[in-house]
């Protein structure tokens, strides 16, 4: 039986190569895809009790979360 996509890379293996511009890292299958294929959680209203994810740098420097949306930089990918 095919293993799940999350099982293809061992926890101790090197982190994937950072995505090129206009691509974002899909956390669920662990590879780079066009940013528009992914969806981040809805933006929080001002004053929400839980902090929003930190804003990412350029997509090639971080894990993107979709064009024009906040994303979460993942140090292991930098």
């Amino acid at each position: 039986m095919r293993r799940g996509p999350r099982s293809l890379r061992g926890r101790d293996a090197p982190a994937p190569t950072p995505c090129v511009p206009a691509e974002c890292f899909d956390l669920l299958v662990r590879h780079c895809v066009a940013c528009g294929l992914l969806r981040t959680p809805r933006p929080k209203p001002a004053g929400a009790s839980s902090p929003a994810p930190r804003t990412a740098l350029q997509p090639q420097e971080s894990v993107g979360a979709g064009a024009g949306e906040a994303a979460l930089p993942l140090p292991g990918l930098l």
Epitope: R6, L28, V29, V33, L38, R39, P41, V63, L74, L77
Partner: antibody
Framework: EVQLVESGGGLVQPGGSLRLSCAAS????????WNWVRQAPGKGLEWVGY???????YYNPSLKSRFTISRDTSKNTFYLQMNSLRAEDTAVYYC???????????WGQGTLVTVSS | DIQMTQSPSSLSASVGDRVTITCRAS??????????MHWYQQKPGKAPKLLIY???DLESGVPSRFSGSGSGTDFTLTISSLQPEDFATYYC?????????FGQGTKVEIK
């Protein structure tokens, strides 16, 4: 806002087949992750599987041999084909859309599947 | 598969009480510095509702009395002051590894 509407549930005999549909509006099923989750009467939630933006599917291994998820992008609808149904497959079946982290933030209303002779 | 164990399975509480539900994973659900742990509320006859994602992020529209914490294998959902509409069943879920799995649920009942 994503809206999901399931259909296709009903009574089926053991060994029979059924196809559930989940019609999505508010976002394209070619974006993100689209799940099926089921809940047997009085029991907890069980993830069935997903189909993602590229059409890649992944299933709960306990169900994979009998259940298949597919999609029709022209209808913005995805499906759960269930074969060789058993009494223990009796459940409410929900479709749900996952966010960037896999959390399911939009759910359908559920459709009841009853497997009984 | 990652097994999710919630405790308690049920609890009785009064309006205004502080309620804590725990969820333990059989292995870490953290990766890339993220906890792939989420919490849902479900009322009878209704679909589940996402409360908390990524262990501690409050879903839009969810009251601030709900909070989540934890990392690795141990996680907590806290309701700071229980309200009448909070009597329901709560589930944790991990999406760190396929197959995604849920806890068995914690039913919060009126004392």
């Amino acid at each position: 806002e994503v809206q999901l509407v399931e259909s296709g549930g009903g009574l089926v005999q053991p060994g029979g087949s059924l196809r559930l549909s989940c019609a999505a509006s508010g976002d394209s099923i070619t974006r993100g992750y689209w799940n099926w989750v089921r809940q047997a009467p009085g029991k907890g939630l069980e993830w069935v599987g997903y189909i993602n933006y590229s059409g890649t599917t992944y299933y709960n291994p306990s169900l994979k041999s009998r259940f298949t998820i597919s999609r029709d992008t022209s209808k913005n609808t995805f499906y759960l084909q269930m074969n060789s149904l058993r009494a223990e497959d009796t459940a409410v079946y929900y479709c749900a859309n996952s966010n960037f982290y896999g959390a399911m933030d939009y759910w359908g209303q559920g459709t009841l599947v009853t497997v009984s002779s | 598969d990652i097994q999710m164990t919630q405790s308690p399975s049920s609890l009785s509480a009064s309006v205004g009480d502080r309620v804590t539900i725990t969820c333990r994973a059989s292995e870490s659900v953290d990766d890339y510095g993220i906890s792939f742990m989420h919490w849902y509320q479900q009322k009878p006859g209704k679909a589940p509702k996402l409360l908390i994602y990524r262990a501690s992020d409050l879903e839009s529209g969810v009251p601030s009395r709900f909070s989540g914490s934890g990392s690795g294998t141990d996680f907590t959902l806290t309701i700071s002051s229980l309200q009448p509409e909070d009597f329901a069943t709560y589930y944790c879920q991990q999406t760190s590894k396929d197959p995604w799995t849920f806890g068995q649920g914690t039913k919060v009942e009126i004392k």
